[in-house]
């Protein structure tokens, strides 16, 4: 038995003409199974292979190879989130989050915990204690005086 | 089994928006386009749209464009169609149905009367 | 946007009766055709895709044929619950138009 074109197998019982639209991206074997083009993939070869380690969770694409990132999520794979807007001496493990590094503190982690190690700012042989974000304090040896024992 | 499961009746008044609901089971969800026809009483089958559930793209008849939006709820397997300034001729069966190659699978339909 | 024409819009025919329905549409869609039955306050049911491939659980008597412009469902012999009204549709490009019906009545 000759099939009609884009029939198949026994009894001619299956079709499959190849396209390239918006209802999918395939061509034919010779039992008129869907053979997806490159980059497509799913039962009907209309979903696309992202850029491969494009993140599953937060990254997908419409054409092949591309890889969009969902909202509060950047980088090429879109597996690096965006921190809080603002965000200076900190990280994120989840969009819009400010985790301060060691020594930093305050939202936007901009205020210097220790800003006596930062800055040195006590002269003289003065000892400096950090006192607070962005403060300290000056204990300064015998006959030097002043908020950095400069006098 | 495959189902397609759709809201219930609504009355809506000429001017309103109508927002049908259609929850499948039975396969994945995302693997398979919905579509929606309508059917007027006593007149034939219209087709108003598709849309491709994995991506949320849709595509509609023109006749309805601007009128019709379709969207997908994929935590829920649940398709959705609204269409808004609603007249007396959207009076209708809405059904939704699943396929490429035909539609071996519909909704029960879902009537939307409308009437001042 | 392609026309689906089929004809006859309606048809009396008697039990044990060979009926044809045509659909021809405005340009080619290939065999990118279905056909569906529909009983009143029902959904319509999947009979024939692709214009030739008799869906899942359709009994044998129906059959469908062409390509291109031209399509055919035909019943061989028809039986009490034959009698509905049969719509074709295209799948080749959107719209996926339907055909007008056909109204398919006991004699």
């Known amino acids: 038995v000759t099939c009609d074109d884009y029939y198949y197998g026994f009894g001619c019982n299956k079709f499959c003409r190849p396209r390239d639209d918006f209802f999918g991206h395939y061509a034919c074997d010779q039992n008129g199974n869907k053979t997806c083009m490159e980059g497509w993939m799913g039962p009907e070869c209309n979903r696309a292979i992202c850029r491969q380690g494009c993140s599953p969770k937060h990254g997908s694409c419409k054409l092949p190879g591309d890889c969009r990132c969902q909202y509060g999520w950047q980088g090429l794979y879109c597996d690096k989130c965006i921190p809080h807007p603002g965000c200076v001496h900190g990280i994120c493990n989840e969009p819009w989050q400010c985790l301060c590094e060691t020594n930093w503190g305050g939202q936007l982690c901009d205020k210097d915990l220790n800003y006596c190690g930062t800055h040195q700012p006590c002269l003289n042989g003065g000892t400096c204690s950090n006192t607070g974000p962005d403060k300290y304090q000056c204990s300064c040896p015998e006959g030097y005086s002043g908020p950095n024992c400069e006098i | 089994q495959v189902q397609l499961v759709q809201s219930g009746a609504e009355l809506k008044k000429p001017g309103a928006s109508v927002k049908v609901s259609c929850k499948v089971s039975?396969?994945?969800?995302?693997?398979?386009?919905i579509h929606w026809i309508r059917q007027a009483p006593g007149q034939g089958l219209e087709w108003m749209g598709i849309?491709?559930?994995?991506?949320?793209?849709?595509k509609y008849a023109q006749k309805f464009q601007g009128r019709v939006t379709m969207t997908v709820d994929t935590s829920t397997s649940t398709a959705y169609m609204e269409l808004s300034s609603l007249r007396s001729e959207d009076t209708a069966v809405y059904y939704c149905a699943r396929g490429y190659d035909g539609f071996a699978y519909w909704g029960q339909g879902t009537l939307v009367t409308v009437s001042s | 946007d392609i026309q689906m024409t089929q004809s006859p819009s309606s048809l009396s025919a008697s039990v044990g009766d060979r009926v044809t329905i045509t659909c021809r549409t405005s340009e080619n869609i290939y065999s990118y055709l279905t056909w569906y039955q529909q009983k009143p306050g029902k959904a319509p049911k999947l009979l024939v895709y692709n214009a030739k491939i008799l869906a899942a659980g359709v009994p044998s008597r129906f059959s469908g044929s062409g390509s291109g412009t031209d399509f055919t469902l035909t019943i061989s012999s028809l039986q009490p619950e034959d009698f509905a009204t049969y719509y074709c549709q295209h799948h080749y490009d959107i719209p996926w138009t339907f055909g007008g019906g056909t109204k398919l009545e006991i004699k």
């Open positions: 849309i491709n559930t994995y991506y949320g793209d849709s």
């Open positions: 039975g396969y994945a969800f995302t693997d398979y386009a």
